[in-house]
Every structure is written in C-alpha cells, then in structure tokens.
C-alpha cells in the first residue's frame, strides 16, 4: 500500500491576511484565523511529517479583498509559489480581470501548473493561451506518479468575463477523455481538481471512470467527521463517500472557504491504484498555530501599498451620497441606487442575442448601508470613504429565485415599517410600491421588474411562476435580516465579487457620479 | 551553518550516464527546493530544474527535460542529479543551489561537480 | 524564455572607480526576482544582491542595485580590489529561469 497526504484550499477569496472568526478584517489578533503566514506553518509541518504530501487548490484564489483589488493576482502566484503549492484548478473568478488578467499576473508567473479540462480555447487566444493552462498534470510524487484533472464551473461566463475565445464545456464530457488518456500512460491515481460545485464534485465521481479523488470548490462546502471546531455546520462527514456507476467509494472534499481551514486527507492505494481508505479533516488554522515569521514580514511589505491605495480618488460625485439609515431603512435612497447600480454594471454579460443581459435586478438591504459620502470634500471618493459605507467584506452574488419568492421578500422589507429594521430594500430594476395602510404580508401593491429578454429594457409586472436572476448581497443569500425565505427558496447561488470592489470599480469607470431618487420604490397615496 | 557538499569529479564517455550527489545540513531539507545549475568552462550559469525534496516533485528546463533526473533521499538529506545520454557539450561544473522561497534568489551553493565527457 | 542580456560582458576599471553593470531583460521581469551573483575563480557563485536591491548578508554597502521592468543596474560606488569578479544577474519571475552570461570585471 501506498499513502499519500491531500493538503487542499479552495475559495480563498485573496484573505492572505488573518482574518477574524467570520472571515472578515482580524480585529483581535489573538483570535484571528487563517491567512498564507499561518497556512505556511502548517503545510510545512505536515511536510516534515509526512512523505506522500500534495498541496492543492481549487481555485477562486482571486478576488475577495483590497489585496487583490491592488496586485490583481500578483499576489496570488506570489504566495501560492512561496507556499510551493503543487498545482492549482481554474475558478470562475479567476477571469473577473478578463482573460489577460489571468494570463500575466497569474497563468505566466505561477511555479506549479494550473489545470481545467473543460477550458478550451479558441480563436487568437488559442495560440496565446496555449500551454499556460493545461487541462490534466501528471505529478511525480515520491517513487509514484499522480494525475491531476482539473475543471472549472461551466457557469463562468455568467458569473466571471472570461472573453468569446473561451467554450466552457460540460465538465463530465470533458474529463472523461482525460482520465482515460491518463490510463493509457499508466497513471492509476487519478485527483479531480476543481472548481463546479459540491454537486458537480459529487456527480463527477459518481460518473467519470478512474477518478479516484475528488477535492472540490465553489460552494464553500464545509465537510467535517466528529465535532465542527468553529461555526461552520458540516454538509457531512470529510471525506464524502461517493459511490461510484462502477461500484468504487470515491472520496469528495472542499475544505469551506477563505483560507479558514486546510483540507487535510490521507489515502491509501493498492498497488494498482485502488483507494483502499480514505480518512481526514479539515485543520482549522486558528491562532493555536503561529504565523511564519518570514511569510507575515513579506505580507507586511506588501500591504504598505495597500495603505496608500485606499487613500487615493476613484471618482468624484457631484452629489450628496445619502447613506443615512434615516434615508436607506425608510425609503428609496440615492447611495442604494449607486450601489444597485453598480452591481448590475459588475454582472454585464452579452452572452445571448435574445438578451439584452441575463440579469436586470438588484436587491439591497438598506441595514447593509452603514454611511454617507459628503460631496463637499472636492467630490472626492476613496476606497477608505467606501469601505465605510460596505464595511463588512461582503460580496454581490447572483441568485436565481421565483417571483413567488421574490414577492415574500419584498413583503418582508416592510412587514415592520418606521422601526429603523435594517431589512428595508434598496432596488435596481425594479419598480415597488407599497401601501403601509396594509396588514404586515399584504402590503406590496405593486412590484415591476426590468425585462432582460428584449431589446428596449422596460418594466412588467412581476410573475409569480417565473424564474428570475437577482444580484443581492451574500449576507441576504444565506438569509440575513430574516430574509429566511430567499435561503429556503433560492434555485441556485453564486458567490460574486467584494461588495467594496464592485463599487469602487463603477464609480473609477464612470469617472463622476450623481445617482438620485427617481422613483424605484414608492408609497401609495394616504399611507406615507 | 548551512551547507551543501557536493561529490566528486566525474570522468565519463559519450552516451553513458552520470549521477552526482548532494548532502545537506545545517537546516530542514524538506525546507527548501533544490535547484541545479550547470556551468561549462568559462561560460554563464544555466538552470536545469529543481526539487521540492518533501515530495520528490520536479520542474526541469525544457532544454533538459528527458535527460535529466533529479531525486532526492530525505532520510539522508542528499539530492542527487542523474544525466543520461552525455555528450561532450556536457563538460561542466554542475552545482546544487538552494533556493529562498518567497523570491526564489539561490541562497546557498555547493562546491560543484566537475563532469568531463570525453572519448 | 526571459533572455537576459547583461552589459558590458567585461570591463577594466581601477580601485576606487565607480562602475555601473546593466541587465536587460527581454520582457517585464518584477523587481521582487531580479538577483545578482559575484563568483570569483575556482569558487560557486554567491548570493550578491537580491530582489534588485537587498544586499546579501556580509556584502559590502558600497554595492547598490536598482531598476524595474527590463532594466536593472548593480553599482560599485567605489572599486576595491576584492570586487574584481564576474557578475551575474538572474531573473526567476517567469519559468525557465535565466541567467545573464556575466560582466567580468578586472583591474586596468
């Protein structure tokens, strides 16, 4: 028998820094979690420990922090080649920078091979983008070998801007002549590296033949065996047992998010390259382990240009941004309509003729909205202004819900209007009227939402049996403000961007700004 | 203190093959990637790949990609480099370097190996 | 491949000079991983100046190093007979790693 040792990241949404318990900015740093200084310690550890070691990572490195906002990947290839991780999957926003964002500061500078099978590109690019990325590596590991798959949401031109010269194809389809091409050069220990989903990482090893692992990313699944030892609450046990069409236990892992915890899973294989056991946990990287003095010390270097950045003018508004809760918890307000728009401006994805985009609207809870921006400063606006007003490192998910669903929320906005709740709704591309003359539950009286599917956007009355897409804050997606009825009903979730990066990326294109109160939410005569 | 010692002068004909050894101390050899670095008389340094000695996993120069092995022993924390099929363009001092892990510079050398190729 | 081109490939100079070697790289090299290297006859090379401008342990303050992109520099701000050696710079920001072919510096 043969082990070898699976260390495994995915999501790290670029927290190189500690952070706190919910993975946001480390306040106390004596319970703080996570970051590449802590991660290093700990990697190291299991290396000196142990033979067989793999460190692996299943992509959505990028985007995440004012890390990434400012070195743009650089800092990923930086610290995962300091880390010596051993190969790395494609994730969808890996391509939030477009197709050369990923090329030059990530694809040409990282020492260990970044792999998606599904991935094929086409056009120019082909030949720009050929050997940069591949789609299976196979990794001499001790006095075996180990194929490496790896694959990538086939959702990332909805969710990500990776250009028209990439075809995300389906990710069985495309692994399956992978795999068997690494069973023609004798590799019989197969890793499926990548970045779908826990639903995708469990059909694929249910369905493509000769995967023997499967370490997965993008749902932020927490697996753990035992007792949890933070917050998370475990989707099952780690590792998840697949049984496979052809009757093998195939082993899936994700290892939650934002560098939190490391995966760690030992298996052992006959010498045929059968999975014999299969055992592990995530190690959850808290202050109990010691941050490497000579990583922290580079961090450190690196963040002084951090500090200068979140000083400098992204734009200018030549109008008050009314962020108050006064304004934001009541009524429509001018900052909420900034922000909505601009994450319907962050989701722009021509990718069908028959629509004008494939998501039109925006929901914000007005609580999220924690303070003004005073015009009076020369106009100015800095990421320091903004990260006042988004100061909890959220993101701007895609979700996908009925207008049933939709309705109820909206009910919820105002079910305790006047009591400064912070589940009031801010809107984009969508039209509301209310009536607080109403009972609680009953009071929406009129709910339009923008079409995507045309030519001239214009507003139509919400229909209950429709499925819609909407950009809204994580916080809202997991049911924040008691908004339990988009977590229960929600037909499909995408994690986005950083919610401060969405913004400050608008307000920097747009160059100056003067969002107002236009008339996106209303009140019926009498009641207001 | 660190350091990294080398075995001896090599002496080998065209087409044969050569391995040469690399016993560190002084630090953890599963630390740090060990690289070699080939340099024929009077001319600059060339990169032929690295090790991560924790897990055996290489990266070679393509130029030398298929002729050159490396390994390692962690028991004894010795790198080894293997060179087939030499030629007499082989001739060279060969040296293991250790490289720094977050700017890759080569900290510490070895005294290299002398390989002459010669019929 | 990142080919690095160092110049001049050799130069006399005299104590208390001060010399200035470049290196040029073929495309956009970060500042982080550009190296320089001293080897003197008969001995490996070592460890000069890392990251452009970080001198390596015991090196001497009258070496300095500078520049970004494609163009780097190693300054002596005053010549010693010691210095008169070969230097190289090396770039690892891309794979394959690279090598300038040296300056050789020796006494007029």
């Known amino acids: 028998a043969w082990e070898l040792t699976i260390l495994h990241t995915n999501d790290v949404h670029s927290r190189l820094e500690q952070t706190s318990e919910d993975s946001s900015k480390c306040v106390n740093a004596s319970r703080c979690m996570g970051g590449v200084a802590r991660l290093f310690t700990k990697v190291q550890q299991i290396r000196r420990a142990e033979p067989n070691v793999l460190l692996l990572d299943a992509g959505d490195q990028y985007q995440g922090t004012i890390w990434f906002t400012v070195y743009k990947g650089a800092e990923v290839a930086h610290f995962m080649n300091a880390l010596r991780y051993d190969a790395m999957a494609l994730g969808n926003h890996e391509f939030d920078n477009g197709v050369e964002g990923l090329i030059e500061p990530l694809l040409k500078e990282a020492k260990f091979p970044i792999l998606s099978a599904n991935i094929k590109a086409k056009g120019p690019l082909a030949s720009q983008i050929s050997g940069l990325y591949l789609p299976y590596k196979v990794l001499p590991v001790g006095d075996e070998v180990v194929g490496i798959v790896g694959y990538t949401s086939k959702e990332t031109p909805f969710l990500s801007n990776p250009g028209t010269n990439l075809v995300f194809e389906d990710e069985i389809t495309a692994l399956q002549p992978e795999v068997d091409k690494l069973k023609t050069l004798n590799v019989n220990k197969i890793i499926a590296l990548g970045h779908s989903g826990f639903e995708m990482d469990k059909l694929i090893a249910q369905k493509v033949r000769g995967v023997d692992v499967v370490v997965g990313g993008h749902s932020n699944t927490f697996l753990y065996t035992g007792n949890p030892p933070s917050k998370e609450v475990p989707a099952g046990k780690y590792p998840f047992i697949v049984t496979s069409d052809d009757g093998r236990k195939v082993p899936v892992v994700q290892a939650y998010a934002f560098g939190k915890y490391l995966g760690y899973l030992k298996i052992e294989f006959d010498e045929r390259g059968n999975v014999i056991s299969s055992h592990g946990n995530p190690i959850l990287l808290n202050s109990s382990i010691p941050e490497d003095p000579s990583i922290k010390a580079d961090i450190n270097k690196w963040r002084i240009k951090l500090d200068n950045y979140s000083t400098q003018e992204l734009g200018k508004t030549i109008v008050y941004l009314d962020g108050s809760s006064q304004s934001c918890r009541f009524r429509e307000c001018n900052m909420g309509n900034l922000i909505c728009d601009a994450m319907i401006n962050n989701n722009l994805r021509h990718t069908d003729e028959m629509f004008w985009n494939h998501v039109s609207m925006c929901i914000l809870n007005g609580g999220g909205i924690r303070s003004p921006i005073d015009e009076r400063n020369n106009g100015t606006i800095t990421w320091e202004n903004l990260a006042a007003v988004l100061p909890f490192g959220g993101t701007f998910d895609l979700v996908q819900l009925k207008g049933s669903t939709l309705k109820k929320a909206f009910e919820h906005s105002v079910h305790r209007y006047g009591q400064s709740t912070g589940e009031f709704l801010q809107v984009g591309g969508i039209h509301v009227v209310y009536d607080l003359s109403r009972k609680p539950g009953d009071r929406v009286v009129k709910l339009d939402v923008l079409c995507t599917k045309c030519r001239v956007p214009s507003y139509d009355p919400l229909k209950m049996d429709e499925v819609y897409k909407v950009i809204l804050p994580n916080f809202l997606a997991n049911g924040g403000d008691g908004f339990q009825m988009i977590k229960d009903e929600l037909l499909r979730h995408d994690s986005g961007d950083q919610d401060i990066n969405v913004v400050s990326t608008y307000i920097s294109k747009m160059k100056v700004i003067y969002p107002a109160v236009e008339g996106r939410i209303k009140f019926s005569t009498g009641s207001h | 203190q660190v350091q990294l010692v080398q075995s001896g002068a090599e002496v080998k004909k065209p087409g044969a093959s050569v391995k040469m050894s690399c016993k560190a101390s002084?630090?953890?050899?599963?630390?740090?990637?060990m690289h070699w670095v080939k340099q024929s008389h009077g001319k600059s340094l060339e990169w032929i790949g690295y090790i991560k000695p924790h897990n055996a996993g290489t990266t070679y120069n393509p130029k030398f990609e298929g002729r050159a092995t490396l390994t390692v022993d962690t028991s004894a924390s010795t790198a080894y480099m293997e060179l087939r099929s030499l030629r007499s363009e082989d001739t060279a001092v060969y040296y293991c370097v250790r490289s720094d892990f977050l700017y890759w510079y080569f900290d510490v050398w070895g005294q290299g190996t002398t390989v002459t190729v010669s019929s | 491949d990142i080919v690095m081109t160092q110049s001049p490939s050799s130069l006399s100079a005299s104590v208390g000079d001060r010399v200035t070697i470049t290196c040029t790289a073929s495309s956009s090299v970060s500042s982080s991983y550009l190296h320089w290297y001293q080897q003197k006859p008969g001995s490996s090379p070592k460890l000069w100046i890392y990251s452009t401008s970080n001198l390596a342990s015991g090196v001497p303050g009258r070496f300095s190093g500078s520049g970004s992109g494609t163009d780097y520099t190693l300054t002596i701000s005053s010549l010693q007979p010691e210095d008169f050696a070969t230097y190289y710079c090396h770039q690892y920001h891309r794979s394959p790693l690279t090598f300038g072919a040296g300056t050789k510096l020796e006494i007029k």
């Open positions: 002084g630090y953890t050899f599963t630390d740090y990637n």
